[in-house]
Amino acid sequence: FKVATLYSLYVCPEGQNVTLTCRVFGPVDKGHDVTFYKTWYRSSRGEVQTCSERRPIRNLTFQDLHLHHGGHQAANTSHDLAQRHGLESASDHHGNFSITMRNLTLLDSGLYCCLVVEIRHHHSEHRVHGAMELQVQTGKDAPSSCVAYPSSSQESENITAA
């Protein structure tokens, strides 16, 4: 399987909510002993490999934000810890995997990485990540709502989390 980032850049005004999304596509094994571990973290654009550095998102680690479920299941982080920080990660039946960040501040700007791991019984088999940039802006130059720029071209799309 592969991970695609639908948008490579999100530009949002302060105070807005945003949902960053990765999509898992390609053959996904749905055997009874196959599960998926999915998570989010902040990183920086390394010279060697993007997403190799792990930093927390609003003080929550990749383990705090992780989901673990069967290949055919939807899941979301319902625990209080994430919600208290204005965060929720979710995964649906169609391979979309997202993190919603509420009430954005300038400190949320940076590189965000999603990680998807296929686990066969007790063994970590495949590890794939995707990366996207979030820019939170303030002042007269800030957009009125979040604008997302697709990974393939620079046509923008207005997106705002509910």
Partner: antibody
């Protein structure tokens, strides 16, 4: 906070059976494997087998087939291991361990405090 | 069955020394886990996937290796590191542990 609480020490007669319990709190018990591990003095750690509480699926180390039997009760979040036809070779500390998937890597992330089983005539 | 052989069985070191213990597998593995056990206590998860430290493990610990050879290194041993360290594979049934390396502090 994840915790695995095991039942207390047992002194058993040869030929008898014993049932050890492992009560889990702090996580979704049904979705993660419970592992059972044997430790005899000077023998290190030995994997006996595992059970997935939600489905009842089990996997055994061939060496312990017929010796150990695993069950789980999801209503009480408790896993059990029964050891039968006890001999002095079964005298050991038995641990239950909960599978944790950390950074996408499953491992023995949570351990009970151990149950000492002594077999003596 | 994949056999994990740890060496040395007993390792004696003075505080501040660098120590390395090894774990050799009878078949090639993708990665190795390590656990620490102190007398009278349950094992603790210590290093996962060859080189990643579990939460709370001091940075003086490190792990490395690939294929059939793996190692755990402590850059500067401290008294609290006295324990037995076990390697473990979760690649094939039966899942096995090494025999352990007991670290003694002089």
């Amino acid at each position: 906070q994840v915790q695995l609480q095991q039942s207390g020490a047992e002194l058993m007669k040869p030929g008898a059976s014993v049932k050890i319990s492992c009560k889990a709190t702090g996580y979704t018990f049904s979705r993660y494997w419970i592992e059972w591990v044997k430790q005899r003095p000077g023998h290190g750690l030995e994997w006996i087998g595992e059970i997935l509480p939600g489905s009842g699926s089990t996997n055994y180390n061939e060496k312990f087939k017929g010796k150990a039997t695993f069950t789980a009760d999801t209503s009480s979040n408790t896993a059990y291991m029964q050891l039968s036809s006890l001999t002095s070779e079964d005298s050991a500390v038995y641990y239950c361990a909960g599978e944790e998937v950390y950074d996408g890597y499953p491992w023995f992330g949570y351990w009970g405090q151990g149950t000492l089983v002594t077999v003596s005539a | 069955q994949i056999v994990l052989s740890q060496s040395p069985a007993i390792l004696s070191a003075s505080p501040g020394e660098k120590v390395t213990m090894t774990c050799r597998a009878s078949s090639s593995l993708s990665y190795m886990h390590w656990y620490q056990q102190k007398p009278g206590s349950s094992p603790k998860p210590w290093i996962y996937a060859t080189s990643n430290l579990a939460s709370g493990v001091p940075a003086r610990f490190s792990g490395s290796g690939s294929g059939t050879s793996y190692s755990l290194t402590i850059s500067r041993v401290e008294a609290e590191d006295a324990a037995t360290y076990y390697c473990q594979q979760w690649s094939s049934n039966p899942y096995t542990f090494g025999g352990g390396t007991k670290l003694e502090i002089k």
